[in-house]
């Protein structure tokens, strides 16, 4: 399988909600024996290797805000850890895992990982992470509304084997 | 465009605080503004930030120690309860672009002693 | 917690000559980095952002290169009016303390 990300950038004003999203492509095991850990980070900008350095998200960690579930199962965070932080992250059954971001800071801004482990039981794991980057504004310049930039073809299937 | 602190003034311990940046030509509607400190022979240091829709943003050691507010044409900050390692140069600064940044703009700064 | 060391924290060089002042963050903070130059009795002025970009009307004597964790300052044909104190800021949204100045070097120029 592999991780699309449909935008590469999201550029907010201060003070908005954001929901950042990644999807799964591709054929997904639905065996009993396999489960999926998916969880969401922040990283460095002009790493070698993109994704590979964890920062926490609002200073939740990712096992903070990881979902873990089977297949194409839907499943989100009820962590009152997540929500007092303004976070919250998503899976629905058609592969689409998301975080959304409330009432955004100048601080927000950043390199965003989402990382997908598909779990095989007594067997190997398999990992692919999506890259995106949210800008927070404020100012006369700033959107008064989230923009998003679609990847380009090539970067929505952006993923790296971890 | 120019930025003036002002109230900086010898204080007690203990006894609070308020310095006032008076900006003109500037619309802070439009700029984040801040805060930098400067003891005497020492380097700078960030204090605080405060954005257009008035969001705060504190130096981890200076929250609660010091708060950030604004009006049309002043920003100020007010130093809680002053320590001797509160003696510096205040300096007022306008941040430079839209998003998380740096200063381009600075005034000339207003001392702050505080001694018993 | 995060550092931005300076080095050296003072030096000396000719007119005409050229200083190199480096900056080394604890962290990586790409290429979120300012520097400013500050003389006696009055506030920073800022040379370079990102990094790299010089700041409208600084000479392009000052120049700023690095990413990551190792940022430089190079200054070409010193002048007199060059003697000052400079700093480097690091403004990366996500570094915890928000944002860092170094610790300063002073030039002294001859």
């Known amino acids: 399988f592999k991780v699309a990300t449909p935008y590469s950038l999201y550029v907010c004003p201060e003070g908005q909600n954001v929901t950042l999203t990644c999807r799964l492509l591709g054929p997904v095991d639905k065996g009993h024996d396999v489960t999926f850990y998916k969880t969401w980070y922040r990283s460095s900008r002009g790493e070698v290797q993109t994704c590979s350095e964890r920062r926490p998200i609002r200073n939740l960690t990712f096992q903070d805000l990881h979902l873990h579930h089977g297949g194409h199962q839907a499943a989100n965070t009820s962590h009152d850890l997540a929500q007092r932080h303004g976070l919250e992250s998503a899976s629905d059954h058609h592969g689409n895992f998301s975080i959304t971001m409330r009432n955004l800071t100048l601080l927000d801004s950043g390199l965003y990982c989402c990382l997908v482990v598909e779990i095989r039981h007594h067997h190997s794991e398999h990992r692919v992470h999506g890259a995106m980057e949210l800008q927070v504004q404020t100012g006369k310049d700033a959107p008064s509304n989230c923009v998003v930039y679609p990847s380009s073809s090539q970067d929505s299937e952006n993923i790296t084997a971890a | 465009q120019s930025l003036e602190e002002s109230g900086g003034r010898l204080v007690t311990p203990g006894t609070p605080l308020t310095l006032t940046c008076t900006v003109s030509?500037?619309?802070?509607?439009?700029?984040?503004m801040g805060w930098v400190r400067q003891a005497p022979g020492k380097g700078l240091e960030y204090i605080a930030v405060?954005?257009?829709?008035?969001y705060t943003y504190y130096a981890p050691w200076a929250r609660g120690r010091f708060t950030i507010s604004r009006a049309s044409t002043t920003v100020d900050l007010k130093v809680t309860s002053p320590t001797t390692e509160d003696t510096a140069t205040y300096f007022c600064?306008?941040?430079?672009?839209?998003?998380?940044?740096?200063?381009?703009?600075w005034g000339p700064g207003t001392l702050v002693t505080v001694s018993s | 917690a995060f550092e931005l060391t300076q080095t050296p924290s003072s030096v000396s060089e000719p007119v005409g000559g050229t200083v190199t002042i480096k900056c080394q963050a604890s962290?990586?903070?790409?290429?979120?980095l300012a520097w400013y130059q500050q003389k006696p009795g009055q506030p920073p002025k800022l040379l370079i952002y990102?990094?790299?970009t010089l700041e409208s009307g600084v000479p392009s004597r000052f120049s700023g290169s690095g990413s990551g964790t190792e940022f430089t300052l190079t200054i070409s044909d010193l002048e007199c009016a060059d003697a000052a104190t400079y700093y480097c800021?690091?403004?990366?949204?996500?570094?915890?303390?928000?944002?860092?100045f170094g610790g300063g070097t002073e030039l002294v120029v001859k």
């Open positions: 600064a306008r941040w430079a672009g839209t998003g998380w940044g740096y200063f381009n703009l």
């Open positions: 030509g500037i619309d802070l509607s439009d700029y984040a």
């Open positions: 405060i954005s257009p829709i008035a």
């Open positions: 962290e990586s903070v790409s290429n979120y």
């Open positions: 990102g990094a790299s």
């Open positions: 800021q690091e403004y990366d949204p996500s570094i915890d303390s928000g944002s860092v």
